[in-house]
């Protein structure tokens, strides 16, 4: 796995332990929490990042209307089970044997149950809507400029292919970034939209996952774009299965 050979660190994931114990003395990095080897030339999967986070010390209108099936991550942090590829296992359980099914970004998509709960497959999140509100500026950003810079950000910082940035909508002060990636579209080596969205979310919160890089400093024609609120909606290829009780709560 590629890492910075000179000082043996992982540029794309600071929540790793790296040592020159790979083949031929090459730098190899393992994620905290899981101990899984990670590829430092690309983003680490959200599942491994969440696991690492849980293991770390605690101190460390033209706009889109989300569909009725859109999920928001209301459950927050948990210590997930990841498969050998670093993806979320379809069924997640806590220490008290409460279980639930998750989608490919690790967000709960069923009611909670017990150990008898079955989650037949990991359902893919194929559409992510990132809803941002920026701080007041002298004037509105130019929509085309904003589109260009946000696409550049996802392409350059998160290595997400531009074809997966479906649209950038803007109605001052609200910006919406739509990421779309069907199973059939995602080729080997492509960054997953869920991982890109997670890195972006952490960047926006000032909790960059990149090693030694400065935080996110986004400017549009020299004008800083400062985000004051973020909401992320997840749409799955198969709608979630919640009881009516939850839906009417």
């Amino acid at each position: 796995h590629t890492a910075a050979q000179d000082n043996c660190t992982c540029p794309t994931n600071k929540m790793t332990v790296c040592s020159p114990d790979g083949p031929g003395g090459r730098c190899q990095c393992r994620a905290l929490g899981s101990g899984m080897a990670v590829d430092c030339s690309t983003l680490t999967s959200k599942c491994l990042l969440l696991k690492a986070r849980m293991s770390a010390p605690k101190n460390a209108r033209t706009l889109v209307r989300p569909s009725e099936h859109a999920l928001v991550d209301n459950d927050g942090l948990y210590d997930p089970d990841c498969d050998p590829e670093g993806r979320f296992k379809a069924r997640q359980c806590n220490q008290t044997s409460v279980c639930w099914c998750v989608n490919s970004v690790g967000v709960r998509r069923t009611d909670k149950g017990d150990l008898s709960l079955r989650c037949d497959e990991l359902v893919r999140t194929h559409h992510i809507l990132i809803d941002l509100r920026h701080r007041p500026t002298a004037g509105a950003f130019n929509h085309s400029d904003l589109d260009a810079e946000l696409r550049r950000l996802f392409r350059e910082r998160y290595r997400l292919h531009p074809k997966f940035v479906a649209a950038v909508h803007y109605e001052q002060p609200t910006i919406q970034i739509e990421l779309r990636q069907n199973t059939s579209q995602k080729a080997a080596g492509d960054v997953d939209i869920g991982d890109a969205a997670y890195y972006f979310e952490r960047d926006i919160k000032g909790e960059s996952l990149f090693q030694g890089r400065g935080g996110l400093d986004l400017r549009v024609r020299g004008e800083p774009l400062q985000v004051e609120r973020t909401l992320i909606y997840y749409l799955d290829e198969i709608p979630p299965k919640f009881s009516m009780k939850r839906l009417t709560a």
Epitope: D147, R151, R157, A167, G214, G222
Partner: antibody, heavy 117, light 111 residues
Framework: QVQLQESGPGLVKPSQTLSLTCTVS?????????WNWIRQPPGKGLEWIGY???????LYNPSLKSRVTISRDTSKNQFSLKLSRVTAADTAVYYC??????????WGQGTLVTVSS | DIQMTQSPSSLSASVGDRVTITCRAS??????????LHWYQQKPGKAPKLLIY???NLESGVPSRFSGSGSGTDFTLTIRSLQPEDFATYYC?????????FGQGTKLEIK
Amino acid sequence: QVQLQESGPGLVKPSQTLSLTCTVSGYSISSGYYWNWIRQPPGKGLEWIGYISYSGRNLYNPSLKSRVTISRDTSKNQFSLKLSRVTAADTAVYYCARDTTAYFDYWGQGTLVTVSS
Amino acid sequence: DIQMTQSPSSLSASVGDRVTITCRASESVSSSVNRFLHWYQQKPGKAPKLLIYRASNLESGVPSRFSGSGSGTDFTLTIRSLQPEDFATYYCQQSNEDPYTFGQGTKLEIK
């Protein structure tokens, strides 16, 4: 008025490192935009080499990535290109240019670098 | 990498003529609100000069006889009434994906 000016040696020996500097006036390179190097071999087309952003982030052309370093000196309002292990194929006019929102609106006048022993 | 192909490679025309140069990308360079295709003019011994950005926007100071159109993979630069100072080489450039890539150029010569 934004102006860019390239400087550096016009002759470099094969296997050595090509070093060029671009001095920018009329705009602070740390205030915004992306600061690029582009080259043009004699009688041929344009090839993008890479950039350094207002915040110091780099992006390089994969075809040159293993040999290229673009850095900056904000106190002098300059950014620099280093291209290692040069061959005759690296002989070109080298331009620095500002990338506004993914197009090049200001260019230096260019400097010819010849790789020869 | 996205390949940019210009046609023709060279072109002879007279002052006053209407000239069209085309640029084809190997894959789409458009987004929902942007077309990441730009046109430059270069004269011998000089740096390229931006003419048109994002397919159809005229750069400040560029004469209105220049215009651009197209989307997706196919784009056109049109010079409405050629002037003596327009004889030069023209390049298209995409910035939808890195690495940024240029067309091979179209040399516009006096007939």
